[in-house]
């Protein structure tokens, strides 16, 4: 097993999470890349990169776009419109087979709550969006667990729609370390 | 071979202004995020502005944003920054690098740029 | 804006040696840190991105480790080639940042 560290993103309804997930070029630049759920101990692939990559050549399903960078070793993640229902954990995947994913980046527990997005909290717990407006508000705790790195059992992948990106970016803060255990 | 090479350089009034230039080979410049890093004399790294690779997205380091502009032309390979209202702040070897989504993969051998009366 | 800072400023090492390299950010950046070397009059040179992941061409005798918000840049045998500054780069906030530098010298 491999201990991987979890952050956890607090965010308001309508924002909009952005993860980048490295990767080695030299091993999986030409690797399809993916975004999954954990459903229970299930991971859902809920979008997935062509194949092979093509540096920027955005994937779009729904609320979810991928963008892969092969020459920088980067997989760009971003959700627009956060809802509650969202909340969850998160992990970035090089696909290599339906029933087998390697987990890239350590994953993300994402916490979406009702409320005003236009507006930032305190200054202690908030970060200025250096691109874009609105600017927006993330939390990022850091707990940890344990985790092997193959996920199997994959269930049925989403329909992937080539569209353009999001346009918000939200930036986090670490706060709080706790352990949590995630598979068994 | 991969190369940036940055021009432009010179020595310029404060208020002055001035257009750097990057000339790409050896790779895919069309498929790649550039930057513009800079060094001033004896110090560090400071990264001055990004666009994406089909110029829909530009983005600057606070200290230079409305006095400088990044763009590029893929057809020619070139990638430039207009710099306006210079200061003597500004004074540093500009560095042409590609990247800008993460990490700056390729550098050039950097340009000097010095703004003084 | 993310505040990387490294230590210490300078680091005196025999060829040989192990050397040890910290980097601290005043936020998680999670995994998105790279480490650069630049030696006097060149163009820095990617060392690692991702936090440990080695760019291409690097020798094995450098590794990075760390996460969120404290990370190392280790050169398990230091060669003549290998005394320069480096630093490390966060790209987890778009305002990219670098940390101000150590200067590796031969002691």
């Known amino acids: 097993t491999t201990e991987l560290t979890e952050e956890k993103y607090e965010y308001k309804e309508g924002q909009t999470l952005e993860v980048k997930c490295d990767y080695a070029l030299e091993k999986y630049a030409n690797s399809r890349k993916a975004w999954q759920k954990m459903e229970g101990k299930m991971p859902k692939i809920l979008a997935k990169t062509e194949r092979p990559s093509e540096n920027s050549h955005p994937v779009q399903v729904g609320r979810i776009t991928l963008e892969d960078y092969p020459d920088h070793g980067l997989l760009q993640v971003r959700m627009t419109n956060l809802q509650v229902e969202d909340s969850g954990l998160y992990q970035c995947v090089i696909y290599q087979h339906p029933k087998e994913s390697h987990v890239l980046f350590n994953p993300i527990c994402l916490v979406v709550t009702k409320g005003s997005s236009g507006t930032p909290g305190s200054s202690e717990n908030s970060t200025q969006n250096v691109y874009r407006t609105p600017s927006t508000t993330a939390k990022a705790l850091g707990p940890r667990y344990t985790s092997p790195r193959t996920v199997t059992q994959a269930p049925p992948e989403s329909t992937v729609v080539v569209s353009t990106p999001g346009s918000e970016i939200n930036l986090t803060n670490v706060t709080d370390i706790i352990r949590v255990p995630v598979f068994n | 071979e991969v190369q940036l090479v940055e021009s432009g350089g010179v020595l310029v009034q404060p208020g002055g202004s001035l257009r750097l230039s990057c000339a790409a080979s050896?790779?895919?410049?069309?498929?790649?995020?550039m930057s513009w890093v800079r060094q001033a004399p004896g110090k560090g790294l400071e990264w001055v502005a990004n666009?994406?690779?089909?110029?829909?997205?530009?983005y600057y380091v606070d200290s230079v944003k409305g006095r400088f502009t990044i763009s590029r032309d893929n057809a020619k390979e070139s990638l430039f920054l207009q710099m306006n209202s210079l200061r003597a702040e500004d004074t540093a070897v500009y560095y042409c690098?590609?990247?800008?989504?993460?990490?700056?993969?390729?550098w050039g051998q950097g340009t000097m740029v010095t703004v003084s009366s | 804006e993310i505040l990387m800072t490294q230590s210490p400023a300078t680091l005196s090492v025999s060829p040989g040696e192990r050397a040890t390299l910290s980097c601290r950010a005043s936020?998680?950046?999670?995994?998105?840190l790279a480490w650069y070397q630049q030696k006097p009059g060149q163009a820095p040179r990617l060392l690692i991105y991702?936090?440990?992941i080695r760019a291409t061409g690097i020798p094995a005798r450098f590794s990075g480790s760390g996460s969120r918000t404290e990370f190392t840049l280790t050169i398990s045998s230091l060669q003549s080639e290998d005394f320069a500054v480096y630093y490390c780069?966060?790209?987890?906030?778009?305002?990219?940042?670098f940390g101000q530098g150590t200067k590796l010298e031969i002691k």
């Open positions: 690098a590609r990247g800008g989504i993460s990490t700056f993969d390729i």
């Open positions: 050896g790779i895919t410049f069309s498929n790649s995020w």
């Open positions: 780069q966060q790209y987890k906030n778009w305002m990219y940042t």
């Open positions: 991702g936090a440990s």
């Open positions: 666009i994406k690779q089909d110029g829909s997205e530009k």
């Open positions: 936020q998680s950046v999670s995994s998105n």
